[in-house]
């Protein structure tokens, strides 16, 4: 799993737009039935918030035990609390399930800070507000953890939706979504609409509010506006993509595009922030500082350590720039851009000292493991994880937070040459060099 500020939280070459638009996603060749349209039963099936994660209700075992499970596109294990823990209201009780099967194998997952470990087994799993199917899936029963579960988050497990290559203990442990597709007629795709509130939510408000939608097996048109634009999944491990250009308020950061993807760029619903490689982060912050220079902020704010507050309702969104990421398109030499607002990258936080002021954390941070397009990016967009066609789609989310002057955007096409050069090739460890 990605290091750094991941949930569970502990705490390019651009060019002129082409004259012709590429075909809209819906104009492409027909797709298998049941793949698109309306998925009323799945709309609004997520709750939560960017700082603590978005979760879906799932049932495990026979008779079914209901648990809230964090939706994480940055990992590949289905793992649930299976022993008492101070932060868990409930947990999976294997001994009460007649369909539980023990795999007699342990699993240990360390993070930069914290870890979880558990015992592998399989059981019957379903998603009440998902497709009407039950699957036998691998489950890691978490028996011990450190800084994994979050007090007050209201989730008891994690649903890793990425590929088998990054599953623990190894890629032979089939991830939940692979099992789902293999055992049912559910198409090999899911889509996420994460809805940031735009203001801090206390625990009871999170429980009462809708956090978004996970549409399993399809695309729901009511969840986005405009067109869906697709970027190829570079490699099926994380949901890896290629960023070809970055702009702050329309100003190109002018870095070698390899830097944007060093050592990878991934789409990860289990990370709060937009995380950028060190060099890119420094250039981006310098540019954002320059753009918002009517007011000076302390270094601690840009490092995500200090909150900045304005009197209620007076946040000057207009002094902060928009950020555009250009992604490799599906057509040779074609890219598109996704643009987020400060309403996405300034994350509302409840400050203990005051209730009448609006306080924010800067939700862009530094990474040593590449770019992570976390919840603050995803909250601007409806994101389609089209595994069947090895691509990820972005459209403007119908629930994104904006103001009367600016809105998040997905626009294209743009002419961009040599985009393949933007990908970084992680050196493979040569086993032979390790022999002595």
């Amino acid at each position: 799993t990605q290091h750094g500020i991941r949930l569970p939280l502990r705490s390019g070459l651009g060019g002129a737009p082409l004259g012709l638009r590429l075909p809209r996603e819906t104009d492409e060749e027909p797709e298998e039935p049941g793949r698109r349209g309306s998925f009323v039963e799945m709309v609004d099936n997520l709750r939560g918030k960017s700082g603590q994660g978005y979760y879906v209700e799932m049932t495990v075992g026979s008779p079914p035990q209901t648990l809230n499970i964090l939706v994480d596109t940055g990992s590949s294990n289905f793992a649930v609390g299976a022993a008492p823990h101070p932060f868990l209201h409930r947990y999976y009780q294997r001994q009460l399930s007649s369909t539980y099967r023990d795999l007699r194998k342990g699993v240990y997952v360390p993070y930069t800070q914290g870890k979880w470990e558990g015992e592998l087994g399989t059981d019957l799993v379903s998603i009440p507000h998902g497709p009407n199917v039950t699957v036998r899936a691998n489950i890691a029963a978490i028996t011990e953890s450190d800084k994994f579960f979050i007090n007050g988050s209201n989730w008891e497990g994690i649903l890793g939706l990425a590929y088998a290559e990054i599953a623990r203990p190894d890629d032979s442990l089939e991830p939940f979504f692979d099992s789902l597709v293999k055992q049912t007629h559910v198409p090999n795709l899911f889509s996420l609409q994460l809805c940031g509130a735009g203001f801090p939510l206390n625990q009871s408000e999170v429980l009462a509010s809708v956090g978004g939608s996970m549409i399993i097996g399809g695309i729901d048109h009511s969840l986005y506006t405009g067109s869906l634009w697709y970027t190829p999944i570079r490699r099926e491990w994380y949901y890896e993509v290629i960023i070809v250009r970055v702009e702050i308020n329309g100003q190109d950061l002018k870095m070698d595009c390899k830097e944007y993807n060093y050592d990878k760029s991934i789409v990860d619903s289990g990370t709060t922030n937009l995380r950028l490689p060190k060099k890119v982060f420094e250039a981006a912050v310098k540019s954002i500082k320059a753009a918002s220079s009517t007011e000076k902020f302390p270094d601690g704010f840009w490092l995500g350590e200090q909150l900045v507050c304005w009197q209620a309702g007076t946040t000057p969104w207009n002094i902060f720039p928009v950020i555009s990421l250009y992604l490799m398109g599906e057509v040779t030499n074609q890219s598109f851009r996704i643009t987020i607002l400060p309403q996405q990258y300034l994350r509302p936080v409840e400050d203990v000292a005051t209730s009448q002021d609006d306080c924010y954390k800067f939700a862009i941070s530094q990474s040593s493991t590449g770019t992570v397009m976390g919840a603050v990016i995803m909250e601007g967009f409806y994101v389609v994880f089209d595994r069947a066609r090895k691509r990820i789609g972005f459209a403007v989310s119908a629930c994104h937070v904006h103001d009367e002057f600016r809105t998040a955007a997905v626009e294209g096409p743009f002419v961009t040459l040599d985009m393949e050069d933007c990908g970084y090739n992680i050196p493979q460890t040569d086993e032979s060099t390790l022999m002595t």
């Epitope: 009517t294 302390p298 601690g300 909150l307 304005w310 000057p316 400050d351 306080c359």
Partner: nanobody, 128 residues
Framework: DVQLQESGGGSVQAEGSLRLSCTAS??????MGWFRQAPGKEREGVAV????????YYADSVKGRFTISQDNAKSTVYLQMNSLKPEDTAIYYC???????????????????????WGQGTQVTVSS
Amino acid sequence: DVQLQESGGGSVQAEGSLRLSCTASGYTYSLMGWFRQAPGKEREGVAVINSGVGTTYYADSVKGRFTISQDNAKSTVYLQMNSLKPEDTAIYYCAARRSWFTGMTTTQALDPDWFSYWGQGTQVTVSS
């Protein structure tokens, strides 16, 4: 249009009192304060108030003698100056900032660099 309008300056004998007022318009400000500049010296922070949480910050040289306050509408800030000394002679400027930040120290609060909006200044002269 952003405006900070000071009033209340003047001449006074040592140990006397003055009350400065600053009325702000244009924005809602979180931090408002008073700074001063004596001839040939750098501009220095005197007192600052955080409208959001009511915190006040004072320079050591004025602690116990000066009091910063604001009216209920929060668009006017006052500096009550008692026990004035000749070394308090300076041009007094009202300054404002739209945001505040957690962990703000007195040094930061009284640093003119953090303030974006400034008044024209009002002269205070204290004679012995």
